[in-house]
């Protein structure tokens, strides 16, 4: 299984996001919250340190609304 100690960078990170999110797309940074004025971004969270599936999923684009 995926070990959270591993990091994901470059093409490997992009391919992994496509696998996790499907073709709906993903963001490299999330909107900053009111608590933290600065959004970290997925490169900082998954390339400079380790991340897991749950964290990767937070960068997926929001699917279009159901009809």
């Amino acid at each position: 299984a995926y070990r959270p100690s591993e990091t994901l960078c470059g093409g490997e990170l992009v391919d992994t996001l496509q696998f996790v999110c499907g073709d709906r797309g993903f963001y490299f940074s999330r909107p900053a919250s009111r608590v933290s004025r600065r959004s970290r971004g997925i490169v900082e969270e998954c390339c400079f340190r380790s991340c897991d599936l749950a964290l990767l999923e937070t960068y997926c684009a929001t699917p279009a609304k159901s009809e």
């Epitope: 299984a1 995926y2 696998f19 499907g22 073709d23 709906r24 599936l53 990767l56 279009a64």
Partner: antibody, heavy 120, light 107 residues
Framework: QVQLQQLGAEVKMPGSSVKVSCKAS????????ISWVRQAPGQGLEWMGG????????KYAQKFQGRVTITADKSTSTAYMELSSLGSEDTAVYYC?????????????WGQGTLVTVSS | DIQMTQSPSSLSASVGDRVTIVCRAS??????VNWYQQKPGKAPKLLIY???SLQSGVSSRFSGSGSGTEFALTISSLQPEDFATYFC?????????FGQGTRLEIK
């Protein structure tokens, strides 16, 4: 071109588990994401989940979460799908399907399927 | 989950006919639909990806169209080897889902 090879058939008792294998040959295992798709007799296709073998990152369909485990062994270029608590409704052909990394779900490569029959 | 609804569920046609199979998604999915052909006892085969791109090695008599929620697979002139079951698939958002299939039979 990667070829995905599966074993022919398994017969299992209700309540037991089955582990189906999918061996890649003739290409680069690392360039693919592997999904597992099942097809009950005369029915449609159902995606169970998938894995990026080189990273071990796994995504499951909610329906199977907790009952299915997908793994991969990089050293033998083999992916596995284990399904537990089998019932008669799990009788199906189980396919492994490969999609190129970055296009994980464009299944351009399929194993020949493993028929799993659940019967007492 | 995104539901994919195919119609018709079965279709009878003759060699040389032009046939169209339709697939509707329960929500807008841009152009992220694939089409597969499956023959009895065999694994599915990818024909069309991203709604309209022809997979390498697939005959040009197969074509795909559509975007949003409505998609179509057209076979311009049916050949004997085209009688099979066809499935649509959405890749927009996991869990990946398929249509229930359209069985194309010889009239």
């Amino acid at each position: 071109q990667v070829q995905l090879q599966q074993l022919g058939a398994e017969v299992k008792m209700p309540g037991s588990s089955v582990k189906v294998s999918c061996k890649a040959s003739g290409g680069t295992f690392s360039s693919y994401a592997i999904s597992w798709v099942r097809q009950a007799p005369g029915q449609g296709l159902e995606w169970m989940g998938g894995i990026i073998p080189t990273l071990g990152i796994v995504k499951y369909a909610q329906k199977f979460q907790g009952r299915v485990t997908i793994t991969a062994d990089k050293s033998t270029s083999t992916a596995y799908m284990e399904l537990s608590s089998l019932g008669s409704e799990d009788t199906a052909v189980y396919y492994c399907a490969g999609g190129p990394r970055g296009y994980s779900y464009n299944f351009d490569n399929w194993g020949q399927g493993t028929l799993v029959t659940v019967s007492s | 989950d995104i539901q994919m609804t195919q119609s018709p569920s079965s279709l009878s046609a003759s060699v040389g006919d032009r046939v169209t199979i339709v697939c509707r998604a329960s929500q807008t999915i841009s152009r992220y639909v694939n089409w597969y052909q499956q023959k009895p006892g065999k694994a599915p085969k990818l024909l069309i990806y991203a709604a309209s791109s022809l997979q390498s090695g697939v005959s040009s008599r197969f074509s795909g169209s559509g975007s949003g929620t409505e998609f179509a697979l057209t076979i311009s002139s049916l050949q004997p080897e085209d009688f099979a079951t066809y499935f649509c698939q959405q890749t927009y958002s996991p869990p990946i889902t398929f249509g229930q299939g359209t069985r194309l039979e010889i009239k």
